[in-house]
């Protein structure tokens, strides 16, 4: 499956749009800062079957809607941005859908290795367990936003990495 | 391979302006903000003020505000420290640094070779 | 602002030596603090970050630790190239402050 070049488009305009939700100077949450021990080794992306390192950029980018459709979130940031954002993620999951139902099954067998799905789920889960112990506060939201950021670059490469070995 | 390059060193007189650069590559340089650092002969670091290259958001060191104006140009991945009217007392060695924003990585972690100032009549 | 303070400001010791540094914040930083290493001539160089966090390249003799206001930077065993001035330096909160330096030289 070829990832069609509307989905690179789509995901630097995600990256946009999450830059510009923006909403207060960032140098006052320094003492926000958190690790969220992001799963880099799941992006490497060198020992994977192409199967899976779809799934991983799928779930990165359900878990990020899931994420941005909260109460909470509608809340914290920007609606207009917010339905921008909702709008490119969810045409990049229907493309990587597509490559999912290809790649993942092989003669009626599934290719997956669950760990690196359960990986990125379990990254996410430290990220909505912060938001919930810092009670959702703008800085805290900022800090996830910067770290929604930072995956999504990590997803970006592990695309062209994706792309070079086609 | 990260870099940091600085102008080259600036001999001045009082009174006269002055702009430095420091330019990013081997990374995104927006992902990443850009710190000013003074040392002065002899003695220890100052921190000055921190740019956010994606929006150019600034935060000075209220010991330098005022003192020093901090921009920068994302098309060219370059931080500037500038001077409007220099005193003697800005002669001082000038380093610019990578700081990872709000993400979760190391401070400061790549640094510019310095731009030496010296002012004087 | 915060201030540091380190102490000593300057120390002499022998090749092999343990040496420990340490620094203070008025407030507490949580660990938000790196140590910086910063030879003659030669822009500083991150050692230690998040207090404890050792900055890859950076040989394994460099530790650190302490969180709040109390931190400590130890070489544990001193090689030639080690002689050199350490500061810490809060990333707490903006204006983000460095300590006053602390010179290690040979005894």
């Known amino acids: 499956c070829d990832l069609p070049q509307t989905h690179s488009l789509g995901h630097r305009r995600t990256m946009m749009l999450l830059a510009q939700m923006r909403r207060i100077s960032l140098f006052s949450c320094l003492k926000d800062r958190h690790d969220f021990r992001f799963p880099q080794e799941e992006f490497d992306g060198n020992q994977f079957q192409k199967a899976e390192a779809i799934s991983v950029l799928h779930e990165v980018i359900q878990q990020t809607f899931n994420l941005f459709s909260t109460k909470d979130s509608s809340v914290a940031w920007d609606e207009r941005l917010l339905d921008k954002l909702y709008t490119e993620l969810y045409q990049q999951l229907n493309d990587l859908e597509a490559c999912v139902m290809q790649e993942v099954w092989v003669g009626g067998t599934p290719l997956m290795n669950e760990d690196s799905i359960l990986a990125v789920r379990k990254y996410f889960q430290r990220i909505t367990l912060y938001l919930t112990e810092k009670k959702y506060s703008p800085c805290a939201w900022e800090v996830v936003r910067a770290e929604i950021m930072r995956s999504f670059s990590s997803s970006r490469n592990l695309q062209e990495r994706l792309r070079r070995k086609e | 391979e990260v870099q940091l390059v600085q102008s080259g060193a600036e001999v001045k007189k009082p009174g006269e302006s002055l702009k430095i650069s420091c330019k990013g590559s081997?990374?995104?340089?927006?992902?990443?903000?850009i710190g000013w650092v003074r040392q002065m002969p002899g003695k220890g670091l100052e921190w000055m003020g921190i740019?956010?290259?994606?929006?150019?958001?600034?935060r000075y060191s209220p010991s330098f505000q005022g003192q020093v104006t901090i921009s920068a140009d994302k098309s060219i991945s370059t931080a500037y420290l500038q001077w409007s009217s220099l005193k003697a007392s800005d002669t001082a060695m000038y380093y610019c640094?990578?700081?990872?924003?709000?993400?979760?990585?190391?401070?400061?972690?790549?640094w510019g070779q310095g731009t030496l100032v010296t002012v004087s009549s | 602002d915060i201030q540091m303070t380190q102490s000593p400001s300057s120390l002499s010791a022998s090749v092999g030596d343990r040496v420990t540094i340490t620094c203070r914040a008025s407030?507490?930083?949580?660990?938000?603090l790196n140590w910086y290493q910063q030879k003659p001539g030669k822009a500083p160089k991150l050692l230690i970050y998040?207090?404890?966090s050792l900055q890859s390249g950076v040989p394994s003799r460099f530790s650190g630790s302490g969180s709040g206001t109390d931190f400590t930077l130890t070489i544990s065993s001193l090689q030639p190239e080690d002689f050199a001035t350490y500061y810490c330096?809060?990333?707490?909160?903006?204006?983000?402050?460095f300590g006053q330096g602390t010179k290690v030289e040979i005894k």
């Open positions: 640094a990578r700081h990872p924003g709000l993400n979760w990585a190391p401070d400061f972690d790549y």
């Open positions: 081997g990374y995104s340089f927006t992902s990443y903000w």
């Open positions: 330096q809060q990333s707490y909160s903006t204006p983000l402050t």
């Open positions: 407030q507490s930083i949580s660990s938000y």
């Open positions: 998040a207090a404890s």
């Open positions: 740019i956010d290259p994606s929006d150019s958001d600034t």
